[in-house]
């Protein structure tokens, strides 16, 4: 997270850290007792490592009563996701068991109405991704409020040049932005999950390269079918 600040501890009980061999790789969001939503591209970086999900965390390194690491029973990338595109960049991870819910671990309601968020709406993004262009990684969860950017502007030739489909949304990236390591994390508008940070190798914090987020409402049927 660039241009953000430390999040209120455990105020985002839906926040997950997708880890490989004990190291944070991507963000994720608890959407049901046994399911975490993240980005499909995160799995590519996992290679053959052991994928686990950390819930109830604020600090990645310090002991916290609510923290628990879950093994992954099943990883379900969207069937149309591809390594060479950010289209359909969603991944569902089934935990080895139902998460123990409490004040610091709770699923987040996700948007089912397939309608664009109004441009200018301030949405919350959180993650353990890098906090500087030098690549500094935070130990504690960071967050930032970002305004939603209209798709037409995002698709300008000078910006993402038509790459943003109806199933994606953009947010401003002018010095405040999501970045490497935040992929798979939640974009929350009005307390509801609207988007998931895509995991392309986009430059961060450059206003001409807005953040790209996969719109969860556009994938409601797929999410429901996997969770069923």
């Amino acid at each position: 997270i660039l241009g953000g600040r430390e999040a209120e501890a455990h105020a985002r009980p839906y926040m997950a850290s997708v880890q490989v061999n004990g190291e944070h790789l991507c963000g994720g969001v608890l959407v049901a007792e046994q399911w975490v939503l993240s980005a499909a591209h995160c799995l590519e970086d996992a290679a053959d490592g052991k994928v686990q999900v950390l819930l109830g965390a604020h600090s990645l390194s310090q002991p916290e009563p609510s923290k628990r690491l879950y093994d992954v029973l099943r990883a379900v990338p969207h069937p149309d996701s591809r390594p060479d595109t950010i289209d359909h960049d969603l991944l569902l991870l089934q935990l080895s068991e139902k998460a123990t819910l409490g004040p610091a671990v709770r699923p987040l309601p996700w948007q089912r109405v397939d309608r664009d968020v109004e441009p200018g709406t301030l949405c919350d993004v959180a993650g353990w991704g890098i906090v500087s262009h030098a690549g500094r990684r935070p130990d504690r969860l960071q967050h930032v409020l970002l305004p939603v950017l209209d798709r037409a502007t995002c698709n300008r030739r000078t910006h993402h040049d038509g790459a943003i489909t109806q199933r994606m949304m953009c947010a401003e990236s002018n010095r405040r932005d999501s970045c490497k390591g935040d992929s798979g994390g939640p974009l929350v508008c009005g307390g509801v999950l609207e988007g998931v940070v895509t995991s392309g190798s986009r430059v961060c914090g450059n206003r001409k390269k807005p953040g790209i987020y996969t719109r969860v409402a556009s994938y409601a049927a797929w999410i429901d079918s996997v969770l069923a």
Epitope: E8, E172, G190
Partner: antibody, heavy 121, light 106 residues
Framework: EVQLQQSGPELVKPGASVKISCKAS????????MHWVKQSHGNILDWIGY????????SYNQKFKGKATLTVDKSSSTAYMEIRSLTSEDSAVYYC??????????????WGTGTTVTVSS | QIVLSQSPAILSASPGEKVTMTCRAS?????MHWYQQKPGSSPKPWIY???NLASGVPARFSGSGSGTSHFLTISRLEAEDAATYFC?????????FGGGTKLEIK
């Protein structure tokens, strides 16, 4: 606790412009969006827009586009709102407001002292 | 834009009574905020995200609701509760406020 101190009351003529200020008491001014709200007679609250002091990004309620302009001076931790082409409809109390918390459920947890603008010939 | 309608516009009740005011939205709002304002003062945050009390708000206040209907309830009214209460949605730009409920103490 952060405080937002606004400039004093203004009596202005129709057609003129007015620029009101909102000074934050702490030095983390650039970390937080500054919103402006109009309270008309009859107590109606209208959100005007916001500006991000960190990067200058702003967003306006369509109703106030062309009427209000939001700016900031980072060096003095002050936000400004200019209202132009004033009419009697613009007579109101104007508040700056911000969210200084860090939960995902942002709201206006700090409000300015309010500036009364009276438009009269 | 999302239009918020508050009712009643004026609510008159006696100390010790339980009172409830309503905020209805023209389209679904997952969470609602509430502010208290007394004459001559700036609004104060009162309840955020539907049911969370802002700092310093007495426990006799509570918030509830979902979708298009949200409520602010005072379990036992006290004289100091006399004020106007505004609801506000933050789901969508432009952020909108209700017209307010003025609470008067008999």
């Amino acid at each position: 606790e952060v405080q937002l101190q606004q400039s004093g009351p203004e009596l202005v003529k129709p057609g003129a412009s007015v620029k009101i200020s909102c000074k934050a008491s702490d030095n983390s001014f650039t970390g937080y969006y500054m919103h402006w709200v109009k309270q008309s007679h009859g107590n109606i609250l209208d959100w005007i827009g916001y500006i991000d002091p960190y990067n200058g990004v702003s967003s306006y309620n369509q109703k106030f586009k062309g009427k209000a302009t939001l700016t900031v001076d980072k060096s003095s931790s002050t936000a400004y709102m200019e209202i132009r082409s004033l009419t009697s409809e613009d007579s109101a109390v104007y508040y700056c407001a911000s969210y200084y918390g860090s939960s995902p459920y942002w709201y206006f947890d700090v409000w300015g002292t309010g500036t009364t603008v009276t438009v009269s010939s | 834009q999302i239009v918020l309608s508050q009712s009643p516009a004026i609510l008159s009740a006696s100390p010790g009574e339980k009172v409830t005011m309503t905020c209805r939205a023209s389209s679904s709002v997952s969470y609602m905020h509430w502010y208290q304002q007394k004459p001559g003062s700036s609004p104060k945050p009162w309840i955020y995200a539907t049911s969370n009390l802002a700092s310093g708000v007495p426990a006799r206040f509570s918030g509830s609701g979902s979708g298009t209907s949200h409520f602010l309830t005072i379990s036992r009214l006290e004289a100091e509760d006399a004020a106007t209460y505004f609801c506000q949605q933050w789901s969508s730009n432009p952020y909108t406020f209700g017209g307010g409920t003025k609470l008067e103490i008999k």
